[in-house]
Structure formats: structure tokens, C-alpha cells
């Protein structure tokens, strides 16, 4: 039993860290492997994560890690029975992958604009709430060449879009993802898409 690609881990910096790794052959992750994790200081409690298969030889483990602070470092040990396959350190604050923005909705707005709104995935008391910036991808459902990317660097989770910048009568889809610049995070996963028809009148809520 050998690890091909060692665990790569990311934290949402609120409640969960996820590690993924690849074995050198198809593996029943939950039956054969365990990932133990603990805060790296003397006397800290050891926890065990039962991995799941993402693919034949790819395992993923979701670990509840609450109240992360910048200095926290976790010790990870990957076991196959009594055999230690791999060990390493993981600092959640250095490997942040934000939660996915939610509830992306498109509203008609004044002056022939569309108002795209979504929810910040973090509560106001969390460090990341005020750190997120967003990328919005707007694409024509019938023309792969017709797409636009908008960077939302202000705090509000909204984007105003002039209807005239989109083809009239075309169906468009939008999705949004987030990142936290000060944490040098990776991008979050994309939100589910929301679709609307770009027309000029009458204006109705979608």
C-alpha cells in the first residue's frame, strides 16, 4: 500500500478542512485507510477521519476543525492498519479555500440593468467575512464564445450588469466564486448557475 500523490489539504477557515490524496492503485479508502489529525502540541487530542473514495485510487477526508486561528498547525498521519504511510503538517490559515457563495439570484433593475446578488458564505463574526472578493462568470447558453468575467473587489455581494452588454433575447447563465486575498487563498468552488433571458421589457423578477 503506497501513496502516489501525498495529501493536499484546504480549510474553509470556519468548520472544515478537506484533504485529498492519490494511492498507487485502486483502494477502498474507507476500509483500508485512516487519517489521524491533531493540533500539534503536547497533549492535544487525536482525531480520526475515515476517508471516502472520490475515484478508484483517490481518497478524500473531511475533518471538522472548529475555531481555527492563524497559528494553528495540525499534525496529519495517514495509516493503513498499523503501517504509517505518510505524515505531515497542515496549517489551515495558510491553505484556505473559501466556502462557495450561495443563493445567486438575478433581478431586473432600473435603467435596463440586471442586478446579480448572492450571499457571503461566512457569518459576520468570521475573519473571512470581510476579506472575500468575488469573480462572476456570465455566459451565453447558446454561444460558448460569448462570456464575460467580472471581478467584484468591493465588499457587497452584488453586481450590476447593463442589459445592453448582453445579446438581446439570449439566455445567459451566471455563477460566482470567492477568494480571500489576505489569506492568499485558492478560489472557492463555483456556485450553482442561475439562468435568465436577457430582454429589455417588461421588467419582471427572475
Amino acid at each position: 500500500v503506497k501513496v502516489l500523490h501525498e495529501p493536499s489539504c484546504f480549510s474553509d477557515y470556519i468548520s472544515t478542512s478537506v484533504c485529498q490524496w492519490k494511492m498507487d492503485h485502486p483502494t477502498n479508502c474507507s476500509a483500508e485507510l485512516r487519517l489521524s489529525y491533531q493540533l500539534d502540541f503536547m497533549g492535544s487530542e487525536n482525531h480520526t477521519c475515515v476517508p471516502e473514495n472520490r475515484e478508484d485510487s483517490v481518497c478524500v477526508c473531511s475533518m471538522p476543525i472548529d475555531d481555527a486561528v492563524e497559528a494553528d498547525v495540525y499534525q496529519l498521519d495517514l495509516w493503513a492498519g498499523q503501517q504509517l504511510l505518510w505524515s505531515g503538517s497542515f496549517q489551515p490559515s495558510k491553505h484556505v479555500k473559501p466556502r462557495t457563495p450561495g443563493n445567486l439570484t438575478v433581478y431586473p433593475n432600473i435603467s435596463h440593468t440586471w442586478l446579480l446578488m448572492w450571499t457571503n458564505p461566512y457569518p459576520t463574526e468570521n475573519h473571512l467575512h470581510s476579506e472575500l472578493t468575488y469573480m462572476v462568470n456570465v455566459s451565453n447558453d447558446n454561444d460558448p464564445e460569448d462570456f464575460k468575467v467580472y471581478n467584484v473587489t468591493y465588499m457587497g455581494p452584488t453586481l450590476r450588469l447593463a442589459a445592453s452588454t448582453l445579446k438581446s433575447g439570449a439566455s445567459y447563465s451566471a455563477r460566482v466564486r470567492a477568494w480571500a486575498q489576505t489569506y492568499n487563498s485558492t478560489w472557492s468552488d463555483w456556485s450553482p448557475s442561475t439562468t435568465w433571458l436577457n430582454y429589455y421589457e417588461p421588467w419582471e423578477q427572475h
Epitope: Q38, D40, S89
Partner: antibody
């Protein structure tokens, strides 16, 4: 400049105990896994123990487990090896070594820095 | 545990010659292999890690190659300071293990 200086070696009877120390300087000690490696009189190199950067995790080969304890004091930049129930086959030069990269993983367990070693002789 | 087998156990060479030391792992260790040099009465010194990456300050006449189970360390144009013992060590997981060493002597 990275330096590792071991001390505490000496002659000890079988079944006895000894505590080795390693004073580290020239790098952020608390960022690194640290290891003890020994070299037998026949010049074979053997890994003895490792400890994680924060000291929360330790690991030993089966020949060592239950007899030796690795620990660290990050405030004092010092690594320790408490050896008990010593056997004649534990006779060796004991080296303190530093992991290749800060934090990192077991795949970074190559040793760019070694101390000068401290000799442990177990004999009646 | 992964066994590391080094060959030859010893060899004699002259200054200016090129020599190659080999190391075989009992199972696939990808490229996770380090080489060390040890001179009489001194601590080992890292030469190569990750199979072929030269450690800081190591002269370019040293080169590491190989992956999987077969590895080699080549020393071009031997210099007087190159004589001593050489050890390989895998760093693919726990426990790390070392080869028994190759003693390089002046002919």
C-alpha cells in the same frame, strides 16, 4: 548559520538510562520536524525517532518503541532523547538532524543539517 | 520497511576518474532518494535529495539520477576531497532507511 550541537552521551550499563540534548540555532526551530539518527560501530545509519514541529506527534521504529522518548522545548530551541532500558546494540554515535523543509511532510525527510554527534556506549 | 541495497560496498579510484555508485530500493520510492557523503570522523553531509536535486554548495561534478527502484550517484573528475563513504537514504514515508554505504578509497 544552522548549527546543531548534541550532548549527554557517555558510557552506561545495560538496562541503564541516558538523556541526550541537542541545542539548535540559526533557524526557526519550531517550524521543523526534528530527528535522531544513529550510526553503529559498523557504520550503519539508523533512524531513531522523529518529532513534529509543535511536539504533538512522535514516531519510533519498532526496535526503539517503548524504550526511547523524543521531546522538544521550542522555547529553548532544544531537542531531547530520553533513552531507557539500554541494550548493547544501542551503542552508537547519536546525531540530531533537521528535516529538509519547514513543516513539510515525511517525503521531505532528507537531512541537510547534522550535529557533530554524541557517542553512547552501552557496556557492562 | 523499505530495504536499500548499495553497491559496490567499496571501490578504489584515482583523482580525475569518474565513478558511479548505485542504490536499489526494495519497492518503488518514486524519486524520493537522498545521497550523503561522510568523511572519517565527521558527520554525514547531504549531497542530493529528490533523486537528483543537488544540495546547496555541492559541486556540479556530483549528479544523482534514477527513479522507482534504481538510483545512482555519479562523481565526475574525482577530487582528493571526494574520498570517504557514501550513503543513500529513501525519504518516501516512514521509516526512512539508509543503504549500508559505499567506501570510496584512493587507488
Amino acid at each position: 548559520e544552522v548549527t546543531l550541537v548534541e550532548s549527554g552521551g557517555g558510557l552506561v550499563q545495560p538496562g541503564g538510562s541516558l538523556k541526550l540534548s541537542c541545542a539548535a540555532s540559526g533557524f526557526t526551530f519550531s517550524d521543523y520536524y526534528m530527528y535522531w539518527v544513529r550510526q553503529t560501530p559498523e557504520k550503519r545509519l539508523e533512524w531513531v525517532a522523529y518529532i513534529s514541529p509543535g511536539g504533538g506527534s512522535t514516531y519510533y521504529p519498532d526496535t526503539i518503541k517503548g524504550r526511547f522518548t523524543i521531546s522538544r522545548d521550542n522555547a529553548k530551541n532544544t531537542l531531547y532523547l530520553q533513552m531507557s532500558r539500554l541494550k548493547s546494540e544501542d551503542t552508537a554515535m547519536y546525531y540530531c538532524t533537521r528535516h529538509g523543509s519547514p513543516y513539510g511532510s515525511s517525503r521531505g525527510a532528507w537531512f541537510a543539517y547534522w550535529g557533530q554527534g554524541t557517542l553512547v556506549t552501552v557496556s557492562a | 520497511d523499505i530495504q536499500m541495497t548499495q553497491s559496490p560496498a567499496s571501490l578504489s579510484a584515482s583523482v580525475g576518474e569518474t565513478v558511479t555508485i548505485t542504490c536499489r530500493a526494495s519497492e518503488n520510492i518514486y524519486s524520493y532518494l537522498a545521497w550523503y557523503q561522510q568523511k572519517q570522523g565527521k558527520s554525514p553531509q547531504l549531497l542530493v535529495y529528490n533523486g537528483k536535486t543537488l544540495a546547496e554548495g555541492v559541486p556540479a561534478r556530483f549528479s544523482g539520477s534514477g527513479s522507482g527502484t534504481q538510483f545512482s550517484l555519479k562523481i565526475n573528475s574525482l577530487q582528493p576531497e571526494d574520498f570517504g563513504s557514501y550513503y543513500c537514504q529513501h525519504h518516501d514515508g516512514i521509516p526512512v532507511t539508509f543503504g549500508a554505504g559505499t567506501k570510496l578509497e584512493l587507488k
